[in-house]
Amino acid sequence: LPAPKNLVVSEVTEDSARLSWTAPDAAFDSFLIQYQESEKVGEAIVLTVPGSERSYDLTGLKPGTEYTVSIYGVKGGHRSNPLSAIFTT
């Protein structure tokens, strides 16, 4: 299963960030988004969005904190490899 592509983190504020990515139409049933403070491995927040979505606004972030975010495509119960990025609020 190919991973989503072109993960971009934009509009970063002290407590939010916009994620956007690309994928072929109907390539995935859904996407899994996983993010965490980079220093706190194992405390990830995981959420899903429908396969038709190509963006998501992360909210409730901590100011001045580095985050690692990964997105997985899901199709038929299978997960793609992750596409990842790092950003700081």
Partner: antibody, heavy 115, light 110 residues
Amino acid sequence: GGSLEESGGRLVTPGTPLTLTCTVSGIDLSTSVMGWVRQAPGKGLESIGFIYTNVNTYYASWAKGRFTISRTSTTVDLKITSPTTGDTATYFCARAVYAGAMDLWGQGTLVTVSS
Amino acid sequence: DVVMTQTPASVSGPVGGTVTIKCQASERIYSNLAWYQQKPGQPPKLLIYKASTLASGVSSRFKGSGSGTEFTLTIRDLECADAATYSCQYTSYGSGYVGTFGGGTEVVVE
């Protein structure tokens, strides 16, 4: 696609632990986020928490320590650790489709806490 | 925690008419808002997510709008079947918090 059915709701006395079970059909829990929501009689909806895996659980601040959410490959459980009369409500299990927005719900199970 | 305030508590409108329900967040939540319809004895039904995206199978008579802190659900061409309680929900969650629901608005169809 898919269905959810809650069970385990009953009359309990205050302080008696109670576990509710959500049995899942037609949903792959390994790639799904599930939630528990409750509704007291005549009141509004109240989110308790969400689970992806047994490591990835998220609780409302008021619910932390009072509830435990866990799952197997086919069920999602909600344990009420020490029920009080204020926990009397219908408890719903649901699938999250867009972050915490939930598109598939069970019919709910009624918990009554009374001495 | 983010507090969601819904107004009014109850609203009525004639068959074929339009009603509007408002939801205000205590802080900026961007577009992380959902709307539900619930009838007595039934679980909630998701109508709208991402503030304005219609859930699968939901009539286009339902329209969600807004972002930031102010959101609106508009129901046009009211039908008797629209009589229900409508609730908004902040849909984000994370470490130590879970998005909350508004108190609900009862829609009466005359």
